[in-house]
Amino acid sequence: MKVLQEPTCVSDYMSISTCEWKMNGPTNCSTELRLLYQLVFLLSEAHTCIPENNGGAGCVCHLLMDDVVSADNYTLDLWAGQQLLWKGSFKPSEHVKPRAPGNLTVHTNVSDTLLLTWSNPYPPDNYLYNHLTYAVNIWSENDPADFRIYNVTYLEPSLRIAASTLKSGISYRARVRAWAQCYNTTWSEWSPSTKWHNSYREPFEQH
């Protein structure tokens, strides 16, 4: 039994880091493998992660972590029984993938303005709470070419756009994702999308 693709890990910088790897053949990850991880810190001890299958030869492990700070470094040991298959390390602050925003809502009752709001996925005491910026994706269900991205570079989890920038009388969907420049993170996954029917009063034509 050998590791074909070494584990790569990403952290949500809150409580979970996810590590994925591939074996050289079909593997029952949960019964055959264990990933041991330990914070390089005086008052720490090893934790064991039981991996799950992620395709025939793929495995994934969700490492539980508390109070991540920038200096944190973890040792990782991948075991198959008594055999050490791979040894490595992981610094969560250098591999951050933020949590996806939630509760995306489109408010259509504000005089020809669309107000999109969503929830910051972090609690106020987490460092990323005040460092997220967002991208909002809006697209038409009827016209695949009608697809747009709005970058929200301020901290408030909301976006206002004029309803007239979208076509009237058709349905649109929106979703939002987040990233943090401070840790040069990757983008989060997209939030679940929400749907609304766009309608607004055309202004009277001037003659």
């Epitope: 810190f41 005086l42 008052l43 720490s44 001890e45 090893a46 508390d66 109070d67 700070v69 920038s70 200096a71 944190d72 460092y127």
Partner: antibody, heavy 116, light 110 residues
């Protein structure tokens, strides 16, 4: 709300013993390392001892090694400090603190006075 | 003698900016994060800055921390009378296998 409540302090003669307790609430106690920090009257802070979340890793300041024992009971959400062979210089307010790279929550402290 | 060195006292007038330094070595500050604690008279210490420069929720943004090499500093801008307290820096020291504090700095608001 995180709360740490120390108890067990008091007056003790040199050479005597005392056991301090720290009752924790408002967080998952068994997930976190804990420490004892003390402060002699009019002096600065001194870290005394720390223990990892599952008792697997324990450290002491040189000044208390061999005399003090830190322990915890995760089922009772309680941290302990057994202090033996106490000396006058151990007189201080003893704080327990939730521990990581830093001490993010502190108790209000319990006063230990070692005097004849 | 503390492992981390802080000035014993500092002072400033309301509205001023005050900086407190903390000097260590490669076995503590140089390879670990620095924290700062505020101790108001007659109370337990409180975490003010962690991970060198991060503020816990509830700590005003007048307080800021920084680290460079084996030294760290705490800056307080727009000084207020309620900032009068003792301030301690701290870091884990891997050669001592212990957490080490600075001797503390007594801040007086004139």
């Amino acid at each position: 709300e995180v709360q740490l409540l120390e108890s067990g302090g008091g007056l003790v003669q040199p050479g005597g013993s005392l056991r301090l307790s720290c009752a924790a609430s408002g967080f998952t106690f068994s997930n976190y390392a804990m420490s004892w920090v003390r402060q002699a009257p009019g002096k600065g802070l001194e870290w005394v001892s720390g223990i990892s979340h599952g008792n697997g890793s324990i450290y002491y300041a040189d000044s208390v090694k061999g005399r003090f024992t830190i322990s915890r009971d995760n089922s009772k959400n309680t941290l302990y400090l057994q202090m033996n062979s106490l000396r006058a210089e151990d007189t201080a307010v003893y704080y327990c603190a939730k521990t990581g790279r830093h001490f993010d929550y502190w108790g209000q402290g319990t006063l230990v006075t070692v005097s004849s | 003698q503390s492992v981390l060195t802080q000035p014993p006292s500092a002072s400033g007038t309301p509205g001023q900016r005050v900086t407190i330094s903390c000097t260590g070595s490669s076995s503590n500050i140089g390879n670990n994060t620095v924290s700062w604690y505020q101790q108001l008279p007659g109370t337990a210490p409180k975490l003010l800055i962690y991970d060198n420069s991060h503020r816990p929720s509830g700590v005003p943004d007048r307080f800021s921390g920084s680290k460079s090499g084996t030294s760290a500093s705490l800056a307080i801008s727009g000084l207020q009378s309620e900032d009068e307290a003792d301030y301690y820096c701290g870091s884990w020291d891997y050669s001592l296998s212990a957490y080490v504090f600075g001797g503390g700095t007594k801040l007086t608001v004139l």
